[in-house]
């Protein structure tokens, strides 16, 4: 019986550690997406809608704060279309791309962690054209460290959940 | 305020060619695209093509393909539309119209005139 | 390629009655469309775009609605400068025009 005592409350103890351990899964929030054809900044997803979801992380000004140290696995899924119905691409050669980058406010600094994408060439005579970008990568993260996306060309963002979403979750401690 | 100004009435004789002008002001002519529309004698309202003012590239409708040219002249403000090998079909008010897309804040000419010029008569005849 | 359809090609109504114009899209065009009111002399002026938004100046007796391949233009109460011809329009396709007159 005391065995079992044992094993019920180490059962509890590794799910209330699980429980703990920092994830988030953002989507793209479809009606603030910024304009530019440029490299843009991404700051408007949602956190607890859908199939966005956060714990032990704060989202907050577009960016996605580290709660506590560790290693985290973050990755990034960007999709770009376009269908003629909304009028034509101005130019026909693109640069799609998108940035994963890490700010520190301690030591202010920045550095960009992972990027991904392709230059294009999406042609005038066809109806619909689309591309993804997915990256995702192994990194030490400290406590108050933000994360955040920043894309080329965001009027071509898909905006549904599951085509444009970020996130990250701890996989273990810093020894 | 915006406004585009167009060239006066133009009369041709088949098998001729003829340039209409379309001077812009009030706004940043190169980030914006031109688009050239004409109406022929009770027909309806017909695309024919746009430039980028920005970067030169143009579109045009399968129907002018090979007979109409459009450039423009950013220093100038202006942007021109040349129809070859007339006939009398051509005859039509041609409008010149700003696609309200600013091309500084995305990639898509959108397809929304926000503002058109007074028209070109343009009139074919032997 | 898409083809715009409008009705009715003309009507008549007196001044203060309400007038719809319908515009149908071959296939679904999702909310890109756009209308014009076109008068004999005049440049044209866009009036709504993007099935629903008023474009900025115009009086809001007009206003747009629709979505997919079926839209309509609604004057709430014509008044004696609305007298023109109105066209629907989908990037490259416009609608044949609705030449509205008092009666």
């Known amino acids: 019986e005391k065995a079992m005592v044992d094993g019920s409350w180490l059962d509890l103890a590794k799910r209330s550690k699980l429980e703990a351990q920092p994830f988030a899964h953002l989507t793209i929030n479809a009606t603030d997406i910024p304009s530019g054809s440029h490299k843009v900044s991404l700051s408007s997803w949602y956190h607890d809608r859908g199939w966005a979801k956060i714990s032990n992380m704060t989202f907050s000004n577009g960016k996605l704060i580290v709660n506590q140290d560790g290693f985290y696995y973050l990755y990034a899924n960007i999709c770009f279309r376009h269908h003629e119905t909304s009028g034509d691409l101005a130019t026909e050669y693109l640069q799609l791309m998108v940035y994963v980058t890490k700010t520190s406010i301690k030591i202010p600094s920045s550095h960009t962690l992972m990027k991904g994408g392709s230059t294009k060439y999406w042609s005038g005579n066809s109806e619909f054209h689309f591309y993804s970008i997915n990256v995702g990568g192994f990194f030490k993260l400290r406590s108050g460290e933000e994360i955040s996306i920043e894309v080329s060309n965001p009027s071509l963002l898909d905006p549904d959940q599951d085509a444009t979403y970020f996130g990250a979750f701890k996989v273990r401690d810093i020894d | 305020q915006v406004q585009l100004v167009q060239s006066g009435a133009e009369v041709r004789k088949p098998g001729a060619s003829v340039k209409v002008s379309c001077k812009a002001s009030g706004y940043d002519f190169s980030n914006y695209a031109i688009h050239w529309v004409r109406q022929a004698p009770g027909q309806r309202l017909e695309w024919m093509g746009w430039?980028?003012?920005?970067?030169?590239?143009?579109k045009f409708s399968q129907k002018f393909q090979g007979r109409i040219t459009v450039t423009r002249d950013t220093a100038a403000s202006t942007a021109y539309m040349e129809l070859r090998s007339l006939r009398s079909e051509d005859t039509a008010v041609y409008y010149c119209?700003?696609?309200?897309?600013?091309?500084?804040?995305?990639?898509?000419?959108?397809?929304?005139?926000?503002?058109w010029g007074q028209g070109t008569l343009v009139t074919v005849s032997s | 390629e898409i083809v715009m359809t409008q009705s009715p090609s003309s009507l008549s109504a007196s001044v203060g009655d309400r007038v719809t114009i319908t515009c149908r899209a071959s296939?679904?065009?999702?909310?890109?469309l756009n209308w014009y009111q076109l008068k004999p002399g005049k440049a044209p002026r866009l009036l709504i775009y993007?099935?629903?938004s008023l474009q900025s100046g115009v009086p809001s007796r007009f206003s747009g609605s629709g979505s997919g391949a079926e839209f309509t233009l609604t004057i709430s109460s014509l008044q004696p400068e609305d007298i023109a011809t109105y066209y629907c329009q989908h990037t490259r396709a416009f609608g044949q025009g609705t030449k509205v007159e008092i009666k």
């Open positions: 430039i980028n003012a920005g970067n030169g590239n143009t």
């Open positions: 119209a700003r696609d309200s897309a600013n091309m500084v804040r995305g990639i898509i000419i959108a397809y929304y005139f926000d503002y």
């Open positions: 296939q679904s065009i999702s909310r890109y």
């Open positions: 993007g099935a629903s």
